[in-house]
Interface confidence: low
């Protein structure tokens, strides 16, 4: 990987470890958000039988959760690097709505649901300084996302707690998605 | 080389904003996201947010959500930070600091605001 | 926020002593941890980065290390423009936060 601007390789104080690359700083960063989502997931199951739910077709019908698909160039038959990276950013702007919609969802793990959301701000950006193509970057609406959130909040418990399970379990897979991807780059 | 020129001391009324700007050179401006970043006489480093000049996407600490807005001039290469509603509390120095390539860090900062809110 | 415990907050020595400055974060950040001197009167400068890595053009004598929540920084033989005052940061989750400070007198 190249030596960043303003740094020489030879200026690292510990030989065995030199500074963290973009991809490894990016790497490291979505690890982090599934560490948190980990936990997440454990308050959300112990607290209801949402986990093991047969019926979370239901509540996905109302839902838009962003999801990999062939055409986005992330998989490794038909892939392409740009595309896939403009979808992982995408995705990742797109799923920022439904992390609003979690930071009110959790009693032991507040600070948790807080970090998780925070922490995707911060892998947007460095994604978004590894993005070449910034201008194919479509911004979801803020309106139609605060219209999205008081649809969601208006749920009744039942549909809060699967809408709060699908939100990880979806965010969980792109993330897992998004970091093989982001390892062939 | 690397330089961030920041505006001149300020003496503000409780009450009032000020607008304070922080003009790079010596790199490419909308390359590198610029942090804010707060210290009081005598006390530590208080981190108010940052922005991406490029984008004009910013994100706060939030503590200064309500305090701080910040905007990127590209044309000029000048990052802006404004405060409103300030108190005694809000008297301080305030630097501007480029984000280093591979991280959050604060790699060239500049010589410092002084902000002084009295009546 | 993480909160970063910075020990001690002064520290007088002498040229050619050993110093050790102590930053403790009240959970783990892995190792995106930042080292900052301060002269009197003058802007932070970054000194380390990542834990351990030496911003470029800084002296040896300088060194970081840690473990994922204890942080030690280095001065291996002080002298005398290392008169300053030596900030830790976090940047592992925002708000990036900064250790209170530990001023750094010579005899």
């Known amino acids: 990987a190249p030596v960043p601007p303003g740094e020489d390789s030879k200026d690292v104080a510990a030989p065995h470890r030199q500074p963290l690359t973009s991809s490894e700083r990016i790497d490291k960063q979505i690890r982090y958000i599934l560490d948190g989502i980990s936990a997440l997931r454990k308050e959300t199951c112990n607290k209801s039988n949402m986990c093991e739910s047969s019926k979370e077709a239901l509540a996905e019908n109302n839902l838009n959760l962003p999801k990999m698909a062939e055409k986005d160039g992330c998989f490794q038959s038909g892939f392409n690097e740009e595309t896939c990276l403009v979808k992982i950013i995408t995705g990742l702007l797109e799923f920022e709505v439904y992390l609003e919609y979690l930071q009110n969802r959790f009693e032991s793990s507040e600070e948790q649901a807080r970090a998780v959301q925070m922490s995707t701000k911060v892998l947007i950006q460095f994604l978004q300084k590894k993005a070449k193509n910034l201008d194919a970057i479509t911004t979801p609406d803020p309106t139609t996302n605060a219209s999205l959130l008081t649809k969601l909040q208006a749920q009744n418990q039942w549909l809060q707690d699967m809408t709060t399970h699908l939100i990880l379990r979806s965010f969980k897979e792109f993330l897992q998605s998004s970091l093989r991807a982001l390892r062939q780059m | 080389q690397v330089q961030l020129q920041q505006s001149g001391a300020e003496l503000a009324k409780p009450g009032a904003s000020v607008k304070m700007s922080c003009k790079a050179s010596g790199y490419t401006f909308t390359t590198y996201w610029m942090h804010w970043i707060k210290q009081r006489p005598g006390q530590g480093l208080e981190w108010i947010g940052y922005i991406n000049p490029s984008t004009g996407y910013s994100e706060f600490n939030q503590k200064f959500n309500d305090k701080a807005t910040l905007t990127a001039d590209r044309s000029s290469s000048t990052a802006y930070m404004q405060l409103n509603s300030l108190t005694s509390e809000d008297s301080a120095v305030y630097y501007c600091?480029?984000?280093?390539?591979?991280?959050?860090?604060?790699?060239?900062w500049g010589q410092g605001t002084t902000l002084t809110v009295s009546s | 926020s993480i909160v970063m415990t910075q020990t001690p907050k002064f520290l007088l020595v002498s040229a050619g002593d050993r110093v050790t400055i102590t930053c403790k974060a009240s959970q783990s950040v892995s190792y995106d941890v930042a080292w900052y001197q301060q002269k009197p009167g003058q802007s932070p400068k970054l000194l380390i980065y990542y834990e351990s890595n030496r911003y470029s053009g800084v002296p040896d004598r300088f060194t970081g290390s840690g473990n994922g929540t204890d942080f030690t920084f280095t001065i291996s033989t002080v002298q005398a423009e290392d008169l300053a005052v030596y900030f830790c940061q976090q940047v592992y989750t925002s708000p990036y936060t900064f250790g209170g400070g530990t001023k750094l007198e010579i005899k």
């Open positions: 600091a480029r984000d280093a390539y591979y991280g959050n860090y604060e790699d060239y």
